[in-house]
């Protein structure tokens, strides 16, 4: 039979950050290759990463078509000899379906992790500082342009700012559902800043890691009386 000595894929894992989405699995193939299929709940299966010896498949192009859809994926284990005849032989020589393993369902809007944010700039005017978070571009498209994280999540995305005097350990925090903070500071003091992205409506993957710390007196900042 065409499926002899094939090992079904296992440990299927979605790795997704800011919608860049890769399906990973095990084991490393021996005398077999893999083909991945993806579909929406109501759609047809689409094959990707045909007859690959990799144990990952980038499915970003598919999931960014509609990040609020639910996606199903499966990994077929195809005997090496069947994979040499072209794409039409995903099914074995006797027409039987090769073994496959289903991934858990994937909802990009809910499941993609938030990437580490970056502080784009900060500007001091007197006793106020305006801190701006970089609005990271995603691979989600609308009308032929790439959308930013804010475009995709809108007010579902908030940022938490941690800030503290360079000379002190006591931190303060502020939040915004835009990409800008306007905070009060003591004149003549240098401050450090770090931000974190949060999606309040989620129950898991709610928070990003903290951004790199940026401090006043470094090149990102500007000072005006």
């Amino acid at each position: 039979s065409g499926t002899t000595n094939t090992v079904a894929a296992y440990n299927l894992t979605w790795k997704s950050t800011n919608f860049k989405t890769i399906l990973e699995w095990e084991p490393k193939p021996v005398n077999q290759v893999y083909t991945v299929q993806i579909s929406t709940k109501s759609g047809d299966w689409k094959s990707k990463c045909f007859y690959t010896t990799d144990t990952e498949c980038d499915l970003t192009d598919e999931i960014v078509k509609d990040v609020k859809q639910t996606y199903l994926a499966r990994v077929f284990s195809v005997p090496w000899r069947n994979s040499t005849h072209g794409k039409e032989t995903l099914f074995g020589t006797h027409g039987e379906e090769p073994p496959f393993t289903n991934a858990r369902k994937f909802l990009p809007y809910r499941d993609t992790k938030l990437g580490q944010p970056t502080i784009q700039s900060f500007e001091q005017v007197g006793t106020k500082v305006n801190v701006t978070v970089e609005d990271e571009r995603t691979l989600v498209r609308r009308n032929n342009t790439f959308l930013s994280l804010r475009d995709v999540f809108g007010k579902d995305l908030i940022y938490t700012l941690y800030y503290w005097k360079s000379s002190s350990s006591g931190k303060k925090t502020a939040k915004t559902n835009t990409n800008e903070f306007l905070i009060d500071v003591d004149k003549g003091e240098n401050y450090c800043f770090s931000v974190q992205a949060v999606i309040p409506s989620r129950t898991v993957n709610r928070k990003s890691t903290d951004s790199p710390v940026e401090c006043m007196g470094q090149e990102k900042g500007e000072f005006r009386e």
């Epitope: 938490t160 931190k171 303060k172 939040k175 915004t176 309040p200 129950t203 709610r206 903290d210």
Partner: antibody, heavy 117, light 107 residues
Framework: QVQLVESGGGVVQPGRSLRLSCKAS????????MHWVRQAPGKGLEWIGL????????IYDPKFQGRFTISADNSKNTLFLQMDSLRPEDTAVYYC??????????WGQGTPVTVSS | DIQMTQSPSSLSASVGDRVTITCKAS??????LNWYQQKPGKAPKLLIY???SLADGVPSRFSGSGSGTDYTFTISSLQPEDIATYYC?????????FGQGTKLEIT
Amino acid sequence: QVQLVESGGGVVQPGRSLRLSCKASGFNIKDYYMHWVRQAPGKGLEWIGLIDPENGNTIYDPKFQGRFTISADNSKNTLFLQMDSLRPEDTAVYYCARDNSYYFDYWGQGTPVTVSS
Amino acid sequence: DIQMTQSPSSLSASVGDRVTITCKASQDIRKYLNWYQQKPGKAPKLLIYYATSLADGVPSRFSGSGSGTDYTFTISSLQPEDIATYYCLQHGESPYTFGQGTKLEIT
């Protein structure tokens, strides 16, 4: 279901220390910001501070900074409030609360602390 | 630090009355304002978040309005079970601050 249960309250002498615990179930504390709030008898609510258990960041009301310390043990899914140099005016019911970033959505039942000689 | 001034500190009203409580912030809190109800011996319960959004399971007679520094909480038709103390909370920046509370009684 989501639940927060405080413990560790009681009667303590002025100048002594007390450590309160808040055991969470039904969710992972590291996914949320967690807060301590207190309420003195017959008085209003008073915010003490917060922790992001995932990275250990803590923020306090300046009036509690240095005397109170918030920490978390993610493996035990538990939040702590270490209170040092206690004073009679620290007598209150102490609540822990979960913060979804738009609101405190779950609160514990509170644990009473009495500071008295 | 942001101060929250809540008024009145107490009020008495009749069943069916429209009740209004206000909170004024010492600076713009960008709608990061919640309203909580607390009954004796119980933890606070969320009623309104982000100034105007009704929390899940909360009756529609409760509502919130406002932006900037001025916020209002309204009970459109007071019910006996609404006897409680009500607090506003700003959480736009630390230290988070509660209003002093409004104790609501029925005449």
